[in-house]
């Protein structure tokens, strides 16, 4: 058993049928010695008396808010949560496996630049009685500071019969140098509590590996005289690290017909312009990627050919 | 990425082309190592990230773009002095910091070159003959060093008398390649920046 926060405790259980569970001793936080009784949740049934209460915690019916009273007055509370270990592996019931970029990816994180700011998100089908708390650091032994905000519900989607809820959090490394070469990964730890179930999820990454630039901005077309060709031009996104001559991007320009089946023409360039043939009803899209370190491509910025 | 390779302009900052080749070569070598050594811990998540140049050179700090020198987090710089003469500086007014930067890059390349050559000698003794260093990568390191053209004492190749532990050597190769790829990215950024300024 360990303390998650004041008066909230997590009991770790080897979870299998007929498991013996864990013996837990609760102590009433009071100078009083006599006349103390204990109850669980809203029930008025007295579980025991005395300054300490010994319970055998086996399943969720044994978890909850234990309260000690004296003469009708509440003295203190202890909330017991359960953390299930199933055959040596901590349970992951609360969050959905996003399966990207690989199986067992519960937390996904992205950064728009090298400033040390990043966003993480996760999915669940649970809509109520759910709380998250996020901590982060650079490195685990002798950790350096990363400050995270509160996790917020950022999107709701309908997936078949189920509703899916996306939560996200923004974090900022306290003293980040965009040009630094990372040798210690960022660690992100999410505590999830659903009703009386506790779970924790972690992700470890280098900022350089989660970079995903914003799409190029100011995408424009300039027709070339007496030609089907157009000059496409764009700019670096505002959120990208500066100076751009140091943090350079490379670009992919795509001409896509109306039908998805039509052949796509693609050109790669390090410049912020390109000459392409514009077909009727086609659209031109441009996306960006760090020129020197192949992390994710940005989303496409698009303009119609007409 | 299969991108068309642009040929540099003749007037271009001479080292930019070499640094681009270096990054391409080390990235290819790392990819090859990860595939060949699939049963070894060779991914970024599995290896310890060690920098053999730590406390010996200060490339990141010495090569910091001017725009980032206002960022206090970038200025925990280590004091290191370097010889300052090099052909990449040839046709430009050069600040002391730029000479320091290029000299630091040269020292990095020299240290990695020695490590890679020592390691290759060990790998050649492996009866499994599983992996060797790409000669192209070693040649590209050499070309960039020649383009930088700094006078510096030659570091003797390390030789070891004891029987090599091939498992450890291959893991060390992975660690070295990961670190060198990260340094090659920094070198490419620096050359691109210097070329633009």
């Amino acid at each position: 058993i360990w303390e998650l926060k004041k008066d909230v405790y997590v009991v770790e259980l080897d979870w299998y049928p007929d498991a013996p569970g864990e013996m837990v001793v609760l102590t009433c936080d009071t100078p009083e010695e006599d006349g103390i009784t204990w109850t669980l949740d809203q029930s008025s049934e007295v579980l025991g008396s005395g300054k300490t209460l010994t319970i055998q915690v086996k399943e969720f019916g044994d978890a909850g808010q234990y309260t000690c009273h004296k003469g009708g007055e509440v003295l203190s509370h202890s909330l017991l949560l359960l953390h299930k270990k199933e055959d040596g592996i901590w349970s992951t019931d609360i969050l959905k496996d996003q399966k990207e970029p690989k199986n067992k990816t519960f937390l996904r994180c992205e950064a728009k630049n090298y400033s040390g700011r990043f966003t993480c998100w996760w999915l669940t089908t649970i809509s109520t009685d759910l709380t998250f708390s996020v901590k982060s650091s650079r490195g685990s032994s002798d950790p350096q500071g990363v400050t995270c905000g509160a996790a917020t519900l950022s999107a709701e989607r309908v997936r078949g019969d189920n509703k899916e809820y996306e939560y996200s959090v923004e974090c900022q490394e306290d003293s980040a140098c965009p040009a630094a070469e990372e040798s210690l990964p960022i660690e992100v730890m999410v505590d999830a509590v659903h009703k009386l179930k506790y779970e924790n999820y972690t992700s470890s990454f280098f900022i350089r590996d989660i970079i995903k630039p914003d799409p190029p901005k100011n995408l424009q077309l300039k027709p070339l005289k007496n030609s089907r060709q157009v000059e496409v031009s764009w700019e670096y996104p505002d959120t990208w690290s500066t100076p751009h001559s140091y943090f350079s991007l490379t670009f992919c320009v795509q001409v896509q017909g109306k039908s998805k089946r039509e052949k796509k023409d693609r050109v790669f360039t390090d410049k912020t312009s390109a000459t392409v043939i514009c077909r009727k009803n086609a659209s031109i899209s441009v996306r960006a990627q760090d020129r020197y370190y192949s992390s994710s491509w940005s989303e496409w910025a698009s303009v119609p050919c007409s | 990425r299969n991108l068309p390779v642009a040929t540099p302009d003749p007037g271009m900052f001479p080292c930019l082309h070499h640094s681009q080749n270096l990054l391409r070569a080390v990235s290819n070598m790392l990819q090859k190592a990860r595939q060949t050594l699939e049963f070894y811990p060779c991914t970024s998540e599995e290896i310890d990230h060690e920098d053999i140049t730590k406390d010996k050179t200060s490339t990141v700090e010495a090569c910091l773009p001017l725009e980032l020198t206002k960022n206090e987090s970038c200025l925990n710089s280590r004091e290191t002095s370097f010889i300052t003469n090099g052909s990449c500086l040839a046709s430009r007014k050069t600040s002391f910091m730029m000479a320091l930067c290029l000299s630091s890059i040269y020292e990095d390349l020299k240290m990695y070159q020695v490590e890679f050559k020592t390691m290759n000698a060990k790998l050649l003794m492996d009866p499994k003959r599983q992996i060797f260093l790409d000669q192209n990568m070693l040649a590209v390191i050499d070309e960039l060093m020649q383009a930088l053209n700094f006078n510096s004492e030659t570091v003797p190749q390390k030789s070891s008398l004891e029987e090599p532990d091939f498992y450890k050597t291959k893991i060390k190769l992975c660690i070295l390649l990961h670190a060198f790829r990260i340094r090659a990215v920094t070198i490419d950024r620096v050359m691109s920046y210097l070329n633009a300024s």
Partner: antibody, heavy 115, light 112 residues
């Protein structure tokens, strides 16, 4: 006393269907994940499928994906394996088992796919 | 498609020490715990070892398990005639959990 009692095995022709049941008693069935495991005659153990305690997630071996469906009825304390498009290579003893460090197995039920 | 490899058979005379190896990889045994089962002919498997080296109550202490890196082993010190059976190791893969990974199985024969 944890008990898993299996039923539903038998002889079936290729391409036909069969449903296996596993009745649980002696524990809170709705709190635990469950597996199906099979063993072809003279061969080793092969995992078939898993279902979460609440039925929310199901996982299958590639060899049965799209043909077999694992399900549970927590009100009846019963686990099921619906097998469709059966093949000769599905011939095996099928076991249900609880998920956890200490597990309990059913007695096994023989499924023979033969024309 | 077994990824946990065991020797097909091992044998020993009563009282001898017999060991069975189970070889896996970094994403399975290297990352997760190992179990060992004993299966007598015509019966369901019986758990002998869980959590690499833990014995459930009722399992004789002549059975012991260990794990090192990407391999595990089961030792029977002082093998007895009733130990003649098939033995399977089991673990998980970190990317496919909760799918059970079983070893190829080892037939233990007690001679004489």
């Amino acid at each position: 006393q944890v008990q898993l009692v299996q039923s539903g095995g038998g002889v079936v022709q290729p391409g036909r269907s069969l449903r296996l049941s596993c009745a649980a008693s002696g524990f809170t069935f709705s709190s635990y994940g469950m597996h199906w495991v099979r063993q072809a005659p003279g061969k080793g153990l092969e995992w078939v499928a898993f279902i979460r305690y609440d039925g929310s997630n199901k996982y299958y071996a590639d060899s049965v994906k799209g043909r077999f469906t694992i399900s549970r009825d927590n009100s009846k304390n019963t686990l099921y394996l619906q097998m469709k498009s059966l093949r000769a290579e599905d011939t095996a003893v099928y076991y249900c088992k609880t998920h956890g460090s200490h597990d309990n197995w059913g007695q096994g039920t023989m499924v023979t796919v033969s024309s | 498609s077994y990824v946990l490899t065991q020797p097909p058979s091992v044998s020993g005379t009563p009282g001898q020490r017999v060991t069975i190896s189970c070889s896996g990889g970094r994403s399975n045994i290297g990352s997760n715990t190992v179990k060992w089962y004993q299966q007598l002919p015509g019966t369901a498997p019986k758990l002998l070892i869980y959590g690499n080296d833990q014995r459930p109550s009722g399992v004789p202490d002549r059975f012991s398990g260990s794990k090192s890196g990407t391999s595990a082993s089961l030792a029977i010190t002082g093998v007895q005639a009733e130990d003649e059976a098939d033995y399977y190791c089991q673990s998980y893969d970190r990317y496919t959990h909760p799918a059970l990974l079983f070893g190829t199985g080892t037939k233990v024969t007690v001679l004489g």
